[in-house]
């Protein structure tokens, strides 16, 4: 075992001479992003105050390519890098095409309406006049491709004019536009060369040791890894912590059970029920508030102030009133819970599926006619699964090195 341990220690660290370095640099696991949209079936009725009715559409599947660049080894046992992602639509794996039309809340209109609720009335009027002149409406009928990667909307220019510096979009707006062909921030992580216990842990993100999106030091902490590999020699007492730039926060997953993936022993880590719990149910999450019902996290502070919420798909593990407020939601543990299967000896993921939902809080805002008589509701926009499983040559090498060889050596 000590010989195996030495081999693992030598080969998991982030060092050009280690076996896993190329695996770390260019992840050989094929990743897929599967997106499911909530098609709004009764937009006119919602504007009259009726309960929203949605139908899940998808999956629309994209192959996700990741590569690290600007890799710089620092002299404090850390390495800095940018990781770029590109997405390629996979028609054969998808249930529909990127040209499918989806009826969705108009995030720019309804988001701006909620944002303006407590703004001066004059600004509200200017925005209403503009919304009307520009033919904006509360719900839009757009293609999957437009929703994902961006569509031209005059409101982008309007918001940039009246809320300067707040909006990360220029000319086009798309929910995944910021992710495609771009990096997720400059990560600086420990290499494990000098101190293996800190391997993969994030030292800084974009030069920051902590973020300032939230209202408590604990919630602003950048904990864990960048979400791709973890320190080796895990036990069932270990937790899986990582910083997610998309969620603008650190997340901690807990050990659930042991298993086997293609002959390789794994630990399965899942989200605790408290991941998106509100502050009254789980006090450490108080810093993520102001909160609505438990089970959804307000990400407006890091998403251009729009009233956007992150949760498990179909409001799984959330306050039941959320799913009951929208017809067509069916939370299901099997289909909607996220998991990561990790090889505990190396801390390398074998199989994972991270599932999250993005929702919009919308309501009638007095003085903004476009919002009609909408009853306050957290309406799901889409949910996605980012999934990957080790396969092919990589899996064969991994199995040989970490399962077969130790067995042979043992005998």
């Amino acid at each position: 075992p000590s010989l195996i341990k030495q081999q693992v220690l030598k080969n998991v660290r982030i060092d050009p001479s280690s076996l896993s370095f190329n695996m770390w640099k260019e992840i050989p696991i094929p990743f897929y992003l599967s997106v499911y949209f909530f098609d709004v079936m009764n937009p006119s009725e919602i504007l009259k105050g009726e309960k929203p009715q949605v139908r899940e559409r998808g999956p629309y599947v994209y192959r996700e390519f990741r590569h690290k660049s600007n890799i710089t080894f620092n002299n404090n046992d850390t390495v800095s890098f940018l990781e770029y992602r590109t997405f390629q639509f996979q028609p054969s794996k998808s249930h529909g095409s990127e040209s499918d039309y989806i009826v969705m809340p108009n995030i720019l209109v309804l988001g701006a309406a909620v944002m303006m609720e407590n703004k001066p009335m004059t600004l509200k009027l200017i925005m209403t006049l503009a919304f009307t002149t520009l033919g904006e409406r509360a719900f839009m009928n757009r293609t999957v491709g437009e929703i994902m990667w961006g569509y031209k909307d005059p409101l982008v220019n309007l918001i940039n004019k009246y809320f300067p510096g707040m909006f990360p979009f220029k000319d086009k707006f798309g929910l995944f536009a910021e992710l495609n062909n771009s990096d997720s921030g400059l990560f600086t992580v420990f290499t494990g060369v000098q101190n293996i216990s800190r391997i993969h842990l994030v030292d800084k993100w974009n030069g920051l040791s902590k973020v300032d999106f939230w209202h408590s030091d604990q919630c602003n902490m950048i904990n864990g890894t960048s979400g791709q590999m973890w320190p080796p020699f895990m036990t069932p007492e270990s937790s899986l912590e990582f910083y997610s730039p998309e969620a603008c926060r650190s997340m901690k997953l807990m050990y659930k059970e042991s298993g086997v993936f293609e002959g390789i022993p794994t630990y399965r880590f899942v989200a605790p029920k408290t991941l998106f719990a509100n502050g009254s149910i789980y006090p450490p999450n108080e810093g993520f508030c102001p909160c609505l019902e438990s089970g959804i996290q307000n990400v407006s502070t890091c998403r251009f102030s729009a009233p956007l919420f992150l949760s498990h798909p179909h409001f799984l593990n959330a306050d039941p009133v959320l799913a009951e407020a929208v017809t067509g939601l069916h939370p299901n543990q099997e289909a909607h819970s996220l998991f990561l299967d990790i090889h505990p000896v190396t801390g390398i993921p074998m199989n994972c599926s991270v599932k999250l939902q993005l929702s919009l809080y919308m309501k009638s805002v007095a003085g903004i006619g476009q919002t009609g008589k909408i009853e306050p509701v957290v309406l799901p926009l889409l949910w996605f699964a980012e999934s990957g499983a080790m396969e092919g040559e990589t899996l064969h090498t991994f199995y040989t090195q970490l399962v077969l060889m130790p067995k042979v050596m043992h005998y």
């Epitope: 009335m121 033919g135 409406r137 476009q370």
Partner: antibody
Framework: EVQLVETGAEVKKPGSSVKVSCKAS????????IIWVRQAPGQGLEWMGG????????NYAQKFQGRVTITADDSTSTAYMELNDLRSEDTAVYYC????????????WGQGTLVTVSS | QSVLTQPPGASGAPGQRVTISCSGD????????VNWYQQVPGMAPKLLIY???QRPSGVPDRFSGSRSGTSASLAISGLQSEDEADYYC???????????FGGGTKVTVL
Amino acid sequence: EVQLVETGAEVKKPGSSVKVSCKASGDTLSSHAIIWVRQAPGQGLEWMGGIIPIFRTVNYAQKFQGRVTITADDSTSTAYMELNDLRSEDTAVYYCAKTLNEGLPWDYWGQGTLVTVSS
Amino acid sequence: QSVLTQPPGASGAPGQRVTISCSGDSSNIESYAVNWYQQVPGMAPKLLIYRDNQRPSGVPDRFSGSRSGTSASLAISGLQSEDEADYYCGSWDDNLNGPTFGGGTKVTVL
């Protein structure tokens, strides 16, 4: 059927004021903004200002600031535009307009009120 | 003086195609969608095209709109006698903080 009904034609002396009304029949005013637009003889359309009736919040075009007052009475579903210190160049047809069908910009207009300023 | 500039007149024989231009700048047409209104003499303006190229229900598909850079245009194909009217372009203007309109183009059917 929804209609925006405006007052009849008016003849005014320079320096005086005119108050034009716009009544929404078959609909309330409050939910959407109302704008006032004028059209001088042989000229284009010119925006004067807008109001959210429910709040009585008003936004005026710079050119008319201080001379125009737009108000609304939600109980009678009527909007008003008062223009002071009239000059001959204020001779125009004055329209009120609103959106009735969501997403259609200013798709409902009043029939217009001709205001003639003459000594 | 209108913020948006239109030619005063355009004409065509029945069945012909007529195009009307509308010119603005970065504070209006370049940044924002354009609407077109039709005004028959003695009547209130009527919405004809909105969001550059969308037609409200009831507007014939002979009418089409487009926008590029700081200008927009309205095309009437298969001109008919009832198309004789004034046509106004409209948009949002940042400097005005409100809607703005063109000076209008009188279309004559020869």
